[in-house]
């Protein structure tokens, strides 16, 4: 399974480094159902 690396902000996913937006400062909607930002 892919490991979510919350401390570094990155995850190893299929041998590729992908930015992991569960990071505290994320504003990408990583949390299911959490309203982020305004209506855009």
């Amino acid at each position: 399974d892919a490991e979510f690396r919350h401390d570094s902000g990155y995850e190893v996913h299929h041998q590729k480094l992908v930015f992991f937006a569960e990071d505290v400062g994320s504003n990408k909607g990583a949390i299911i159902g959490l309203m982020v930002g305004g209506v855009v």
Partner: antibody
Framework: QVQLVQSGAEVKKPGASVKVSCKGS????????VHWLRQAPGKGLEWIGR????????IYTPKFQDRVTLTEDTSSDTAYMELSSLRSEDTAVYYC?????WGQGTLVTVSS | DIVMTQSPLSLPVTPGEPASISCRSS???????????LYWYLQKPGQSPQLLIY???NLASGVPDRFSSSGSGTDFTLKISRVEAEDVGVYYC????????FGQGTKVEIK
């Protein structure tokens, strides 16, 4: 009114594929992740994966890795979930979620 | 996979009385960054689910303050201080320390 509108119910035969759409209405879908979940009849919630419409990056639950494809069309503010090699256990309501908005759900029935 | 286990699976409640639901994870959800990656969702009858609590203790927007959540790294409790009729539905705990997994759900209904 801001909402996510999903495509209608589907009935498929085992082995077939299904493609469910999720269109943002009054909502720019390319700004936030789009998550996909499903709920089998009388069962709990199961996360399928998510897509970042800004760059197309996807993450899938390993269980679905080989059968699911998440895509998006930012020009039409629509995200898609395609599930292949359908089996009876895939009968479920499929939901898309982006930011605080949930789609109404799409019932996919797999039956011979 | 991190397994989320809820209890009870069914909870008859009386309006105006308190209620609580337990959730246990097979692995600690408390990360060294101080965040506990535990969430609570409610699915009301005939509706899509909605987020109630995120990162263990934060109330989502629009959620009444009669809802609260607490816990350790593996044991969590959702409390409703005074149940209202509109609180009926199925409550799910979930984690996203490693991908997302959900508990099996607790059905809350009026006695």
């Amino acid at each position: 009114q801001v909402q996510l509108v999903q495509s209608g119910a589907e009935v498929k035969k085992p082995g077939a594929s299904v493609k469910v759409s999720c269109k943002g209405s009054g909502f720019n879908i390319k700004v936030y992740y789009v998550h996909w979940l499903r709920q089998a009849p009388g069962k709990g919630l199961e996360w399928i994966g998510r897509i970042d419409p800004e760059n197309g990056e996807t993450i899938y639950t390993p269980k679905f890795q080989d059968r699911v494809t998440l895509t998006e069309d930012t020009s039409s503010d629509t995200a898609y979930m395609e599930l292949s090699s359908l089996r009876s256990e895939d009968t479920a309501v499929y939901y898309c979620v982006s930011s605080g908005y949930w789609g109404q759900g799409t019932l996919v029935t797999v039956s011979s | 996979d991190i397994v989320m286990t809820q209890s009870p699976l069914s909870l008859p409640v009386t309006p105006g009385e308190p209620a609580s639901i337990s959730c246990r994870s097979s692995k600690s959800l408390l990360h060294r960054n101080g965040i506990t990656y535990l969430y609570w969702y409610l699915q009301k009858p005939g509706q899509s689910p909605q987020l109630l609590i995120y990162q263990m203790s934060n109330l989502a927007s629009g959620v009444p303050d009669r809802f609260s959540s607490s816990g350790s790294g593996t044991d969590f409790t959702l409390k409703i201080s005074r149940v209202e009729a509109e609180d009926v539905g199925v409550y799910y705990c979930a984690q996203n320390l490693e991908l997302w997994t959900f508990g099996q759900g607790t059905k809350v209904e009026i006695k």
